[in-house]
């Protein structure tokens, strides 16, 4: 069952002290029912699993990827799973932990030592379902080993958003992925209505920046569903 599959990940999502290093310093929040530690910080109790549902890898942490927890599982059940370490099997780059990439179905190191000048690698983009097998359209792309050591600037080839500099995300551009700017207030964004639809975009947009969310533009509420324009708006 899903429960038994996930129980091995029981402590996976344990956060740091609330209001601490979770990226929301000083936020006033209601803590989980949990243990009170000296200093007044509440931690979540380490009592059971906390599956974090997702539709694509960008919704998960940098050390995670988005997939069904069971092989051949319900397509509507996808959660953030811990990334695969070196020499583990993979189907796409995002499955491998930072510092690694997926090559011939295995996570391999992208350390400088493992490169001689430039590497040639297949970036496989599965259209419609990134979590299926490695079919789909493949293109040969040349990646510079430098990208793994200095954060990519806008236009740099990338495998995941953590390869890009601050304010950029890794998004599809034709059949490779490059660092693009995170969207600002008022910019047009893409709202994925159904799971897998992001796989069809050859010019993928980044997500909206912090404090913004992708919503229907107010004056487009009356428009037909197909022509509704979404923009990044303040919460």
């Amino acid at each position: 069952t899903l429960n038994s599959v996930l129980n091995s990940n029981a402590i996976k999502n344990l956060p740091p002290p609330l209001g601490g290093a979770a990226g929301h310093p000083g936020s006033a929040v209601s803590a989980a029912p949990g243990i009170l530690y000296p200093g007044g910080n509440k931690y979540q109790t380490i009592d059971n699993y906390q599956p974090y549902p997702c539709a694509e890898d960008e919704e998960c942490g940098t050390d995670e990827y988005c997939a069904s927890p069971t092989r051949g599982g319900d397509a509507g059940v996808q959660i953030c799973l811990a990334c695969r370490k070196r020499r583990k099997r993979c189907m796409r780059h995002a499955m491998c932990c930072p510092g690694n990439y997926c090559k011939n179905g295995i996570c391999v190191s992208s350390d400088q030592n493992h490169f001689r000048g430039e590497i040639e690698e297949t970036i496989t983009e599965s259209f419609g379902n990134d979590h299926s097998t490695l079919d789909g359209y493949s293109r040969r792309t040349t990646l510079s080993s430098k990208m793994y050591h200095t954060k990519g600037q806008e236009g740099s080839v990338c495998l995941r958003s953590s390869d890009c500099a601050s304010g950029l995300c890794c998004a599809r551009h034709f059949w490779s992925k490059i660092c693009k700017p995170v969207l600002k207030e008022g910019q047009v964004c893409t709202k994925h209505r159904r799971k897998g639809s992001h796989g069809l975009e050859i010019f993928q947009r980044c997500y909206c920046g912090e404090g913004l969310s992708c919503r229907i533009q107010k004056d487009h509420h009356q428009a037909s569903n197909s022509s509704r324009l979404h923009t990044c708006q303040r919460h």
């Epitope: 990226g23 050390d63 988005c66």
Partner: nanobody, 125 residues
């Protein structure tokens, strides 16, 4: 200030239904996963259900599968838990939780960082 406020709890007979709501105010979480957890007397907190930001992925605890349905309305910054065929063992305080957005903000793990104060659900036999 971030606030998650649950409502819709109450006393219901076994076999009955309730619909819980969780409204996010302050900085909202339409881009992040949201979930429901419950805490029954003498037990550990239990995951109930969660939904991705787009609504494209939902996950349920085995104990509620087929009876509970989670949904969200991002325009209203609200997540819902429709609870049908309630059983006495569903009696608990139900907490709403919001995620932190994962790699969007550079976190290594996507997780639930924001919690409501809870709403009591009592199912009598």
């Amino acid at each position: 200030e971030v606030q998650l406020v649950e409502s819709g709890g109450g006393l219901v007979q076994a076999g009955g239904s309730l619909r819980l709501s969780c409204a996010a105010s302050g900085r909202t979480f339409s881009s992040y996963a949201m979930g429901w957890f419950r805490l029954a007397p003498g037990k550990e907190r239990e995951f109930v259900a969660a939904i991705s930001w787009s609504g494209g992925s939902t996950v349920y605890a085995d104990s509620v599968k087929g009876r509970f349905t989670i949904s969200r309305d991002n325009a209203k910054n609200t997540v819902y838990l429709q609870m049908n065929s309630l059983k006495p063992e569903d009696t608990a305080v139900y907490y709403c939780a919001a995620g932190n957005g994962g790699r969007t903000y550079g976190h290594s793990r996507a997780r639930y960082d924001y919690w409501g104060q809870g709403t009591q659900v009592t199912v009598s036999s």
